[in-house]
Interface confidence: medium
């Protein structure tokens, strides 16, 4: 019978941070500058990601791991591994599939992220509107007219509002 010989690939011994150099008799050579190999046994090193323009470096590239990017202030990451940077919306806006859009009347967003939410309905708690709402701010509820007597309590904070979760008709 024919004796089987070892079929182990010599390149499998090359650790992360190196590559199996065919030009040098399959010796494990360190990855060149600005490249990396995150797993052993690789025949080439991958070029490091460069965080340019609106991207900024969150983690430097090393011989064993790629650089990681995030976004400059005023932008936020989208996609796997922060493949895109999208501009933050302003207060009074929300992010939709068509970009940042102003909150419609009766809703507000006091953050640069998230959705427009309905103003608090003060009358549900038997209160009146003390300060009108805007695109950026919820209404402030105050005591009901019947409560406006000497020694009436001060303004109560608005109850949390909840987005209806359906399309406008």
């Amino acid at each position: 019978f024919e004796r089987t010989r070892s079929l182990q690939d010599p390149c499998s011994n090359c650790p992360a941070g190196t590559f199996c150099d065919n030009n040098r008799n399959q010796i494990c050579s360190p990855c060149p500058p600005n490249s990396f190999s995150s797993a052993g046994g690789q025949r080439t090193c991958d070029i490091c990601r460069q965080c340019k323009g609106v991207f900024r470096t969150r983690k430097e590239c090393s011989s064993t791991s790629n650089a990681e990017c995030d976004c400059t202030p005023g932008f936020h990451c989208l996609g796997a591994g922060c493949s895109m940077c999208e501009q933050d919306c302003k207060q009074g806006q929300e992010l939709t599939k068509k970009g940042c859009k102003d909150c419609c009347f009766g809703t507000f967003n006091d953050q640069k992220r998230g959705i427009c939410r309905p103003w608090t309905n003060c009358s549900l708690d038997g209160k009146s509107v003390l300060v009108n709402g805007t695109k950026e701010r919820d209404v402030v509820c105050g005591p009901s007219p019947a409560d406006l007597s000497p020694g009436a309590s001060s303004v109560t904070p608005p109850a949390p509002a909840r987005e209806p979760g359906h399309s406008p008709q």
Epitope: L78, E94, K97, K98, C104, G165, S167, P168, Q169
Partner: antibody, heavy 125, light 111 residues
Framework: QVQLQESGPGLVKPSETLSLTCKVS?????????MCWIRQPPGKGLEWIGC????????YYASWAKGRVTISVDSSKNQFSLKLSSVTAADTAVYYC?????????????????WGQGTLVTVSS | DIQMTQSPSSLSASVGDRVTITCQSS????????LAWYQQKPGKAPKLLIY???NLASGVPSRFSGSGSGTDFTLTISSLQPEDFATYYC????????????FGTGTKVTV
């Protein structure tokens, strides 16, 4: 009353084209949100097929559906349709039409807030 | 293709139990939070429970809650009720070269 209603043949022969229509009532295509088709093979999970933007007519299809699927909209009849060509038994499913929810400003938000009741399409000779 | 994996695929629970379902996506959803959860009962269309990862849809009981960001999300039912026995699906919205939607593999909650 806001609702979606699918209609079309319940039986389609292999290699033929499946055609379904979704009739919209209670609202009109006057915003930039999407109308979509989703299917569910018997006893299996939900599978997105594609969507059409009611604002500009752009279409978005699942990778498996490209080349086989056409979604179109007829705003005058307040309906949209699905055509799936070269069907096989693997296309047997309940087909749902669904509306993408719109933001307060009337733009698509990525999730589905209104669904039709679904229609079973069987592919068999 | 984007893969959305739910775990467990099925679970047995009793009324009053706290139930947690996870959803893992092979890519980050749009804006890290464009993730929705649906409940489906046999012979019925899915019903929206949670949108934007953590927002409760209109008319949904507060025992349902959602959390997570990017690729990993969780649906929690704090105290399971008889009407909650159903199949649950996560759904993500993605933007690469174009808009793309994907559903999770589903989790069936039984008695």
């Amino acid at each position: 009353q806001v609702q979606l209603q699918e209609s079309g043949p319940g039986l389609v022969k292999p290699s033929e084209t499946l055609s379904l229509t979704c009739k919209v009532s209670g609202f009109s295509f006057n915003n930039d949100y999407d109308m979509c088709w989703i299917r569910q093979p018997p006893g299996k999970g939900l599978e997105w097929i594609g969507c059409i933007d009611t604002g500009d007519g752009s279409t978005y299809y699942a990778s498996w559906a490209k080349g086989r699927v056409t979604i179109s909209v007829d705003s005058s009849k307040n309906q949209f349709s699905l055509k799936l060509s070269s069907v096989t038994a693997a296309d047997t499913a309940v087909y749902y039409c669904a509306r993408e929810a719109a933001s307060s400003s009337g733009y698509g938000m990525g999730y589905f807030d209104l669904w039709g009741q679904g229609t079973l399409v069987t592919v068999s000779s | 293709d984007i893969q959305m994996t739910q775990s467990p695929s099925s679970l047995s629970a009793s009324v009053g139990d706290r139930v947690t379902i996870t959803c893992q996506s092979s890519q980050s959803v749009y804006d890290n939070n464009w993730l929705a959860w649906y409940q489906q009962k046999p012979g019925k269309a899915p019903k929206l429970l949670i949108y934007r990862a953590s927002n409760l849809a209109s008319g949904v009981p507060s025992r349902f809650s959602g959390s997570g960001s990017g690729t990993d999300f969780t649906l929690t039912i704090s105290s399971l009720q008889p009407e909650d026995f159903a199949t649950y699906y996560c759904q993500g919205t993605y933007l690469s070269s174009n808009w793309y939607w994907a559903f999770g593999t589903g989790t069936k909650v039984t008695v």
